[in-house]
Each structure stands twice: as C-alpha cells, then as structure tokens.
C-alpha cells in the first residue's frame, strides 16, 4: 500500500520503478496541468511528506525513448 519514502529509500524506489528510463525529481516543465499554476512540487515533497503509491512514482519517470529505426 501507499507509504512515505524518503532519502536513499526514495531513490531506490524510483530506480526500481523507472528502470533504464531514469527519473526526474521535478516533473518536466509543462507536464500535466497548466504551467500558470502555483509552484510545482517534486517527488520528494509528494512522497516524503505524505504517503505515495506506485502510480505517483511512475509520474516522475523519464519518457520512454523511441526505438531507433533501421
């Protein structure tokens, strides 16, 4: 279930969930809702200061790189 993840524990979880894609500590600019909103929170804020689940962690994974064509 959801739990708080802080420090190295959070990094380990992101590495596990995102794998080779890598991850961001902040969502990329323009990600999701309007960029006019209040200051963005990052994965540290979202998962260390309240419980977070797998789906929230996945939001901070880097996008899959498209396969190179032959």
């Amino acid at each position: 279930g959801p739990e708080t993840l802080c420090g190295a524990e959070l990094v380990d979880a992101l590495q596990f969930v995102c794998g080779d894609r890598g991850f961001y500590f902040n969502k990329p600019t323009g990600y999701g809702s309007s960029s006019r909103r209040a200051p963005q929170t990052g994965i540290v804020d979202e998962c260390c200061f309240r419980s977070c689940d797998l789906r929230r962690l996945e939001m901070y994974c880097a996008p899959l790189k498209p396969a190179k064509s032959a």
Partner: antibody
Framework: QVQLQESGPGLVKPSETLSLTCTVS????????WSWIRQPPGKGLEWIGY???????NYNPSLKSRVTISVDTSKNQFSLKLSSVTAADTAVYYC?????????????WGQGTTVTVSS | QSVLTQPPSVSGAPGQRVTISCTGS?????????VHWYQQLPGTAPKLLIY???NRPSGVPDRFSGSKSGTSASLAITGLQADDEADYYC???????????FGGGTKLTVLG
C-alpha cells in the same frame, strides 16, 4: 547517530550576504534531506529551505530570491547563503536533518547559531 | 500570520491533560500531508516530538500523542509535568506554497 553543528559569523552588516555552514558527523550527507530553519528573537520557527544531495532543492517562496543552499560532500557539510540581509534577518539559525525514518519529520537538529544583522 | 494556526498559549496543572490544536487547510493537512510536532524547551533547539501525525520517536514518553482529522491536527499531553513547560510547534507541507510550513507555536505553562 547523526549530529549537526552550525558555524559562521555572528554579526553581518545590512545588505551583505549571510553565510553559514552545517557540519554533519555520524552519517553520510548522501543519504538524507538537509534543512535550514530560523527563529527571530521571541518569535516562531520559519522554514528556509531544504535539499537532497542529488541536487533537489526547495526554498521558502518568501526568501527564494535571496537564498542558496549547497553541499560539499567531500567535507560532509552543507551551507546556507542569504543575500541582501536586513535587520529582519536577525535570528537563531538551525540546520536540521530528515533521516527518512520519521515520515518527513526533522529528527536531528543542530544547537543553533545566533546571527545579528547590524551596522 | 502562519499558514498553520495554533493557540498562542495553553496551561494546565500538574497531572492534568492538555491539548494543542493545529488548524490548516486543504493545501496542507487536508491534502494528506503528514503533521509533525516539535517541543522547544527554553534556550534549546527544537526536538521532534511526534512524527507522521501520531508516531513517537524513541525516547519520547507515551504521555505525548498526536492525531489528525480533516484539515486539523492536535497534540495531547497527559499527566502534565513541570518539565513539559515549553513551546510546541506543528509542521506540515503546503502544496500551494510548495514548501514546509510551521504553526506559530504554542507556549505551554504548567501551573503551580
């Protein structure tokens, strides 16, 4: 057991930059979140900012334009710089640590260092 | 004006039970962010007293307890003792400010 010790000048002139260092012992700076908090005389606690060793930083919006928190992993230290100080920045400055075992609570604090802004 | 609102002072006699409230909003406590409580004895650094709404770090007596409901949290101290006299602060995270926030602090006076 992680221990923290603040150091820096006790007196800073108005418009200058306040610089403080927090030395970490008993733990690696690469494992936790590190914070600065201040307390003006006779007033409450004010969060200044925190960072994770990976480079993630977050600052109090009211101070953001003047604050920089950085880390020196080789010395196991992190520092606070606050520019263009005024008398309102006179306070006891604390460094603190979130080890991650306390759901984001700041479980280790330095003893604090008093900074006076005066000419 | 603090984002988290606490009463400036509370008091009680030795042995009594007192509670300290911490009222927030839908962008901090009400958004599911954990609440932490700190005790600051005169002339000393704050000490973490309750973390994650209702957990005690090792060494903190079970006379101290925390709870959270909706947009508010509270700290309860039972069996009040003279050395509980201190300032108490709540802390959480606020998504609209994208930062940590403290309550204004509550001075606990132990009477007699």
């Amino acid at each position: 057991q992680v221990q923290l010790q603040e150091s820096g000048p006790g007196l800073v002139k108005p418009s200058e930059t306040l610089s403080l260092t927090c030395t970490v012992s008993g733990g690696s700076i690469s494992s936790y979140y590190w914070s600065w908090i201040r307390q003006p005389p006779g007033k409450g606690l004010e969060w200044i900012g925190y960072f994770f060793y990976s480079g993630y930083t977050n600052y109090n919006p009211s101070l953001k334009s003047r604050v920089t928190i950085s880390v020196d992993t080789s010395k196991n230290q992190f520092s606070l710089k606050l520019s263009s100080v005024t008398a309102a920045d006179t306070a006891v400055y604390y460094c603190a640590c979130i080890t991650g075992t306390t759901k984001g609570g700041m479980d280790v604090w330095g003893q604090g260092t008093t900074v006076t802004v005066s000419s | 004006q603090s984002v988290l609102t606490q009463p400036p002072s509370v008091s009680g006699a030795p042995g009594q039970r007192v509670t300290i409230s911490c009222t927030g909003s839908s962008s901090n406590i009400g958004a599911g962010y954990d609440v932490h409580w700190y005790q600051q004895l005169p002339g000393t650094a704050p000490k973490l007293l309750i973390y994650g709404n209702n957990n005690r770090p090792s060494g903190v007596p079970d006379r101290f307890s925390g709870s959270k409901s909706g947009t508010s949290a509270s700290l309860a101290i039972t069996g009040l003792q003279a050395d509980d006299e201190a300032d108490y602060y709540c802390q959480s995270f606020d998504s609209s400010l994208s930062g940590s926030v403290f309550g204004g602090g509550t001075k606990l006076t132990v009477l007699g």
